[in-house]
Amino acid sequence: MAVTACQGLGFVVSLIGIAGIIAATCMDQWSTQDLYNNPVTAVFNYQGLWRSCVRESSGFTECRGYFTLLGLPAMLQAVRALMIVGIVLGAIGLLVSIFALKCIRIGSMEDSAKANMTLTSGIMFIVSGLCAIAGVSVFANMLVTNFWMSTANMYTGMGGMVQTVQTRYTFGAALFVGWVAGGLTLIGGVMMCIACRGLAPEETNYKAVSYHASGHSVAYKPGGFKASTGFGSNTKNKKIYDGGARTEDEVQSYPSKHDYV
């Protein structure tokens, strides 16, 4: 039950995170005009990964797409790439994790297959979250660098009689959405990986176990031990060796209230 809950929660958290990454990628407010210590302008500038916008005090907003590809800064291209990779990996991860969910039964899928799928989706979510966090952080770093450069220009370029309004940009809402969404996707991925450990079938738990016969210091493999003691047929006793895994009865694919959505 705890495994199902962990897996389900991991899926939901990742789903919210990926939705957030998509939202952040599409948002126009990656950088917004810094209003502090600036003349109050009748226009408000803000920029996204795909277009820049100007909102006038009249209420009109005009957005222009970045129609050039080669003319864009390499950093912006890198951020775009990171966000898209994050979305693609996250989307594939979601698709895989749907089939891996313990509460959904597809044919006679083995638990080992579900465990592998859960682990795969978990890793995908972790990489997706890291991509989003990296993308947003690169953009934020770019903003900070440009902010201080333009601040320096503001105070060095005052020699002439005519003043120019230097538009400085600060963190936009999309950055915070991206950071939170990336974090959620990462957490969801970790939860899926944790759930995977609980989903792993019991047989795998025997391989690393050594059994010591009383009075002998000989290690037996499970197969050989089964023949001499009869423990192999009494599957109820598996609990002795199993660090919390389920009994064979629990693994059987009988329909239960958890099997269908």
Partner: antibody, heavy 117, light 113 residues
Framework: QVQLQESGPGLVKPSQTLSLTCTVS????????ISWVRQPAGKGLEWLGE???????NYNSALKSRVSISKDNSKSQVFLKLSSVTAADTARYYC???????????WGQGTLVTVSS | DIVMTQSPDSTTVLLGERATINCKSS????????????LAWYQQKPGQPPKLLIY???TRESGVPDRFSGSGSGTDFTLTISSLQAEDVAVYYC?????????FGPGTKLEIK
């Protein structure tokens, strides 16, 4: 069609508050911002302030402590209040609709306000 | 506050001739976000409210004759009437629409010779 009409008392005593109303038709105040501009006789134009679609305002810093702009979207009316008036506030007061580039594409005919005792 | 200056204060031009009015601002009116200059030109005839001619320094308002054109960028702007007509006699104002307060120029009176 788009129309703006200013109204209010033509005569105000010094130190009193000047109150004007701009009634608009042909458009909604939820879609367009409104600006107030005044013009003393034979002189130039002076921007007083504006009220945005969401109700936010910005005023001329020279008059900031005295000027106040508000609106009633349902009645399609914008209000200008100028407190502690003096003879220097005698002018024709216009309201105008903000358009592209924060320019005023439609103006009212203006209302003449005289400050005198 | 941004100071707007216009030159000349008044000008007399022959009918059909070109009329030019200049406007200078104390700060740049160019918005880097969209590379547009936030300056407007108005025409005011006696006893009438001002009428918008040009916005964004060079965009003609709908219904304005194409003999009116605006140019310039940053701090220096020009309103040109390519062929002066009798109905163009008026006072012309430029306005800063970029930095608050949105100041107007003192006006240029245009008359026919």
């Amino acid at each position: 069609q788009v129309q703006l009409q200013e109204s209010g008392p033509g005569l105000v005593k010094p130190s009193q508050t000047l109150s004007l109303t701009c009634t608009v038709s042909g458009f909604s105040l939820t879609s367009y911002a409104i600006s107030w501009v005044r013009q003393p006789a034979g002189k130039g134009l002076e921007w007083l302030g504006e009220i945005w679609t969401g109700g936010g305002t910005n005023y001329n810093s020279a008059l900031k402590s005295r000027v106040s702009i508000s609106k009633d979207n349902s009645k399609s009316q914008v209000f200008l209040k100028l407190s502690s008036v003096t003879a220097a506030d005698t002018a024709r007061y216009y309201c105008g609709r903000l358009s592209y580039g924060n320019s005023l594409d439609y103006w009212g005919q203006g209302t003449l306000v005289t400050v005198s005792s | 506050d941004i100071v707007m200056t216009q030159s000349p204060d008044s000008t007399t031009v022959l009918l059909g001739e070109r009329a030019t009015i200049n406007c200078k601002s104390s700060q740049s009116l160019l918005n880097s976000g969209n590379q547009k200059n936030y300056l407007a030109w108005y025409q005011q005839k006696p006893g009438q409210p001002p009428k918008l001619l040009i916005y964004w320094a060079s965009t003609r308002e709908s219904g304005v004759p194409d003999r009116f054109s605006g140019s310039g960028s940053g701090t220096d702007f020009t309103l040109t009437i390519s062929s002066l007509q009798a109905e163009d006699v008026a006072v012309y104002y430029c306005q800063n629409n970029f930095i608050y307060p949105l100041t107007f120029g003192p006006g240029t009176k245009l008359e026919i010779k």
